[in-house]
Amino acid sequence: CKAMHVAQPAVVLASSRGIASFVCEYASPGKATEVRVTVLRQADSQVTEVCAATYMMGNELTFLDDSICTGTSSGNQVNLTIQGLRAMDTGLYICKVELMYPPPYYLGIGNGTQIYVIDPEPCPDSDF
């Protein structure tokens, strides 16, 4: 019965299209079959939920249809992608993993990934 450790990259740069991807890996202390993954954003000590998905081990993550997140899972590793990011969304994105079933419950929270988003420069008007 050990505490759960979650690892994620320290820094990620979003693409020019406002897409950022990172891996969230957890060291499972139990044999969980149902896992919940939540992405939290921390800004000025305020924490808000960005998206969340519960999945059965061996199955794909399913986020809500209107979620800005997508992801895939492989063993104790989750590949997360956040879309639609703008410069104002730059911040610390924390991966939270919960082993929901079977009991006991375990919580794991990563140190966060600093995602930098740079809005693309508007294309200059063409004379042609």
Partner: antibody
Framework: EVQLVESGGGLVKPGGSLRLSCAAS????????MNWVRQAPGKGLEWVSS????????YYADSVKGRFTISRDNAKNTLYLQMNSLRAEDTAVYYC???????????WGQGTMVTVSS | EIVLTQSPATLSFSPGERATLSCRAS??????LAWYQQKPGQAPRLLIY???SRATGIPDRFSGSGSGTDFTFTISRLEPEDFAVYYC?????????FGPGTKVDIK
């Protein structure tokens, strides 16, 4: 204002039943896991039970397993604790508490007293 | 289950003094440790989570440190309203457990 208000406590005989309620307001109740925590007179805090936001996952302390049932009604913003086969050692103030996004119990109600005595 | 030990059970201080409380876990809880304050007749109030992060609205005279099995909670300068019972709690795995509490009273 974020608030939790418990009700339903009272005096009950050993072997009896009681149903506690916890009314939530000021936040999106359906987005948060919730807990019941109790405190016997003059004693420390003891976690009783936890329920996930959608009621899919439920956990109990060994001391109440098989006797207590936690539930919630997200449409009514209310958390419940059905307590059956009550014992003298269940006498305590019962608090409902919200699980914050980072894991700790960040919002607590004022508590409701349950006394089990013949 | 993870057992939390708080020592001592009671500490006596004068206002303005520095108070240091201890919490030890029977096995590693990483940083999934919180500190709560409880005054007589009131519900507990979250002060510290993640071993060292202050909850919203908590004055900076309250601080926490530690990870794994050994944790410390400090009040840098005791105010009259700080005399209360303080509980540590681990929330990294169920069953969620609390320490027995340390009462901070006036000398």
């Amino acid at each position: 204002e974020v608030q939790l208000v418990e009700s339903g406590g009272g005096l009950v005989k050993p072997g009896g039943s009681l149903r506690l309620s916890c009314a939530a307001s000021g936040f999106t109740f359906s987005s948060y896991s919730m807990n019941w925590v109790r405190q016997a007179p003059g004693k420390g805090l003891e976690w009783v039970s936890s329920i996930s936001s959608s009621s899919s996952y439920i956990y109990y302390a060994d001391s109440v397993k098989g006797r207590f049932t936690i539930s919630r009604d997200n449409a009514k913003n209310t958390l419940y604790l059905q307590m059956n086969s009550l014992r003298a050692e269940d006498t305590a103030v019962y608090y409902c508490a919200r699980v914050g996004l980072m894991g700790p119990f960040d919002i607590w109600g004022q508590g409701t007293m349950v006394t089990v005595s013949s | 289950e993870i057992v939390l030990t708080q020592s001592p059970a009671t500490l006596s201080f004068s206002p303005g003094e520095r108070a240091t409380l201890s919490c030890r876990a029977s096995q590693s809880v990483s940083s999934y440790l919180a500190w709560y304050q409880q005054k007589p007749g009131q519900a507990p109030r979250l002060l510290i989570y993640g071993a060292s992060s202050r909850a919203t609205g908590i004055p900076d005279r309250f601080s926490g440190s530690g990870s794994g099995t050994d944790f410390t909670f400090t009040i840098s300068r005791l105010e009259p309203e700080d005399f209360a019972v303080y509980y540590c709690q681990q929330y990294g795995s169920s069953p969620f457990t609390f320490g027995p509490g340390t009462k901070v009273d006036i000398k």
